[in-house]
């Protein structure tokens, strides 16, 4: 389960209400840190394990998830034609 | 290089506690979950207890359940392990033990028993009258 | 409970398997000499620590580990104990133990 925690924001600046965000998530057993919809997520260790990302879900609602060649990464593909990768080092 | 180098054995008397502890260097202590296991004397391994890397999850073997708290000191890099209530059947070695999957930060993050890829090199422990 | 043979033996050259079965998430394999530390020779199913021999291999089908020594050398003679976490997936477990004797 994953949670967003506002760190703190610019009170220097009254107009500005930006504020730095970060998850926080506890795995279960048998899960790791993972993407999940563009999000961090616990995800089931064993798709990491084999490099199936898009077993996670990794990307947007809509998007169409595709490994990279050698299971390095995966890209997502918008509807419009966009493409966005990430790689996993 | 990894080191986990456990201290606090030694003869304990029936009833009696102790507190183990592993300092554990060349690596980043906080994202690893920890584990101690411990082998009776001509026996097999036995789980005892494991702890999340940032220490707010903890579980126990059935056999020290009630009698024994895991704890960690991220900033001083030190695994504890507390038991109370000693008897004869807790002799035996107690090896501290590292889960090889590195939680990066914001994660808390169980380790897995069969992801454990350091051992430290044991406290005995003897309990007896 | 973990399922693994209490011994298995080889002759030095030849290959020795040991199975381990009844646990979920991932297998690691430790070897222990008598006097001596506890080694990991496989962990997360089939990997394998930089210091170890490649004549250790690990593979995962189903619920069951196979730890395979391929060419057995005399200082291979050891207990092997596997590890995972128990059925429920709340804790760890550890198997009885299998004694390889190298002929």
């Known amino acids: 389960t994953c949670e967003i925690v506002t760190l703190d924001r610019d009170s220097s600046q009254p107009r500005r209400t930006i504020a730095r965000q970060t998850a926080r998530c506890a795995c279960r057993k048998g899960q790791i840190a993972g993407t999940t919809r563009a999000r961090p997520a616990c995800v089931d260790a064993r798709i990491i394990k084999t490099k199936q990302w898009c077993d996670m879900l990794p990307c947007l609602e809509g998007e169409g998830c595709d490994l990279l060649i050698n299971r390095s990464g995966w890209t997502c593909t918008q509807p419009g034609g966009r493409i966005k990768t990430t790689t996993v080092s | 290089a990894v080191t986990l180098d456990e201290s606090g054995g030694g003869l304990q008397t029936p009833g009696g506690a102790l507190r183990l502890s592993c300092s554990a260097s060349g690596f980043d202590f906080s994202s690893h979950g920890m584990f101690w296991v411990r082998q009776a004397p001509g026996k097999g391994l036995e789980y005892v207890s494991e702890i999340t890397n940032d220490g707010s999850g903890t579980n126990y073997g059935s056999a020290v359940k009630g009698r024994a708290t895991i704890s960690r000191d991220n900033g001083q890099s030190t695994l504890y392990l507390q038991m109370n209530s000693l008897r004869a059947e807790d002799t035996g070695t107690y090896f501290c033990?590292?889960?090889?999957?590195?939680?990066?930060?914001?994660?808390?993050?169980?380790?897995?028993?069969?992801?454990?890829?350091?051992w430290g090199h044991g406290t005995e422990v003897i309990v007896s009258s | 409970a973990l399922t693994q043979p209490s011994s298995v033996s080889a002759n030095p050259g030849e290959t020795a398997k040991i199975t381990c079965s009844g646990g979920?998430?991932?297998y690691g394999w430790f070897q222990q000499k008598p006097g001596s530390a506890l080694v990991t020779v496989i962990y997360w199913d089939d990997e394998r620590p930089s210091d170890i021999p490649s004549r250790f291999s690990g593979a995962l089908s189903g619920s069951t580990n196979t730890l395979t020594i391929t060419g057995v050398q005399a200082e291979d003679e050891a207990d092997y104990y596997c590890?995972?976490?128990?059925?429920?997936?709340?804790?760890?477990?550890f198997g009885a133990g299998t004694t390889l004797t190298v002929l």
């Open positions: 033990a590292r889960s090889t999957y590195e939680c990066p930060g914001g994660f808390s993050c169980w380790g897995d028993t069969g992801q454990i890829d350091a």
């Open positions: 979920v998430y991932s």
């Open positions: 590890g995972t976490e128990d059925i429920s997936g709340t804790a760890g477990v």
